[in-house]
Interface confidence: low
Amino acid sequence: WPPPGTGDIVVQAPTQVPGFLGDSVTLPCYLQVPGMEETHVSQLTWSRHGESGSMAVFHQTQGPNYSEPKRLEFVAARLGTELRDASLRMFGLRVEDEGNYTCLFVAFPQGSRSVDIWLRVLAKPQNTAEVQKVQLTGKPVPVARCVSTGGRPPAHITWHSDLGGMPNTSQAPGFLSGTVTVTSLWILVPSSQVDGKSVTCKVEHESFEKPQLLTVNLTVYYPPEVSISGYDNNWYLSQNEATLTCDARSNPEPTGYNWSTTMGPLPPFAVAQGAQLLIRPVDKPINTTFICNVTNALGARQAELTVQVKEGPPSEHSGMSSN
């Protein structure tokens, strides 16, 4: 230990303390007395920068005195004990409590020692994300919405997407004084390729241990996109029956399939079965263009396919069988 009188007393406290709106917070403040140094603390004082007078005082003989008795409390200081811990608890944190505070020890013989602490008032936001259902507009529109409600400071919202697009972010005052609601829209030109894909809203706030990720599955309503499959250009007479399939992508789902030909109704050897067209064996060559017309709530679209059934090659050929 150093000999008496060579050390100095030091006030220890964090430079910044966070607290949550409406909650209580403790501003820690301790007097460190080195070695065998002798000191007598007669008073603890808390004051706020820019304000005259003290907000909390603890006197060695008179005890505590508070500017707001219901909101302030010395955590450890007690009459009849050595005053080494000036930690102060504040209840019901308000936005206006944010600021710089000074913790001061009045000591003999060393004199006064103080330290400044910045109290930061936070509010943890609530986050939601939702899809904005759209149709094919041909121009950029919001397809997803991410809202961080009641944060202090405002939350930071970013988007992650492989689909392109850009954010549009705005702020408005939150319902609690001093808080902010951040609204971010993800904007892109809707297409059928976007439907069912996802984008992720990332919300960052200093009250979170890690960023919150909210995934939104996009919805784009579009009329059917139609193609016909099942024909390989190698169909021959006197072979097995074959099937054409009308492949349709749409949102909402297709409500009806209608098969026809460029000449009008289906020939006798073609039988419609919903999205499929059954082609029965024929005994003479044909060259027919089939049309599949698909309907959903947004409209109807069609695809065409020309089928040729040719004179037969050697019998081991796979023929019309496309099953």
């Epitope: 409406g22 019901g92 939601t128 809202v147 409600t149 408005a172 319902f175 609690l176 004084s177 609204t183």
Partner: antibody, heavy 121, light 109 residues
Amino acid sequence: QVQLVQSGAEVKKPGASVKVSCKASGYTFTSSYISWVRQAPGQGLEWIAWIYAGTGDTNYNQKFTGRVTMTTDTSTSTAYMELRSLRSDDTAVYYCARHGYTGRGWYFAVWGQGTTVTVSS
Amino acid sequence: QAVVTQEPSLTVSPGGTVTLTCRSSTGAVTTSNLANWVQQKPGQAFRGLIGHTNNRAPGVPARFSGSLLGDKAALTLSGAQPEDEAEYYCALWYSNKFVFGGGTKLTVL
């Protein structure tokens, strides 16, 4: 004196839309929230949405998302609520309410006189 | 979907004290629920009484006070007057929406 004056009663058929107005006076229109609340016959109150007049930022009760749109016209200090695809259970008195400010947060302060919307075929 | 529950009806004698409560189905009511209390007298417009749990609106008599009572929000009327006979609604904030209670019909008798 803060006042909210709403438009008159409406009778609509199912599937139609209604647009109710709420004209504010006696305070700075752009510096507060306006909520819309409804009360069906014999029922309690149901919050529909709020709009912050200064920015047009809105927050809808999910129950009404897609059917309701809130707007403001700052030049006339008027808030509007449009409800689409009306059903018989939308029959209610619709109120606008200005949120006052206490220094601690916002509260339902001044209410309009209410607009009766009847949905009937 | 949160449900907010109030006493359907209460009676208080003139000059007496009565406490109306507001319970949340999601758990304890906290200051984050921004408890609001609204009064509706027959034939009159609604009137805001209390915001943010315990903040009295300007012009509201001091006999009305808001608080948290256990796990509920509460509106206490001390020294009830005949003109306080009305329907009282509480509203709680759940992150992004208000939910109203069914209302309490207060009779001053």
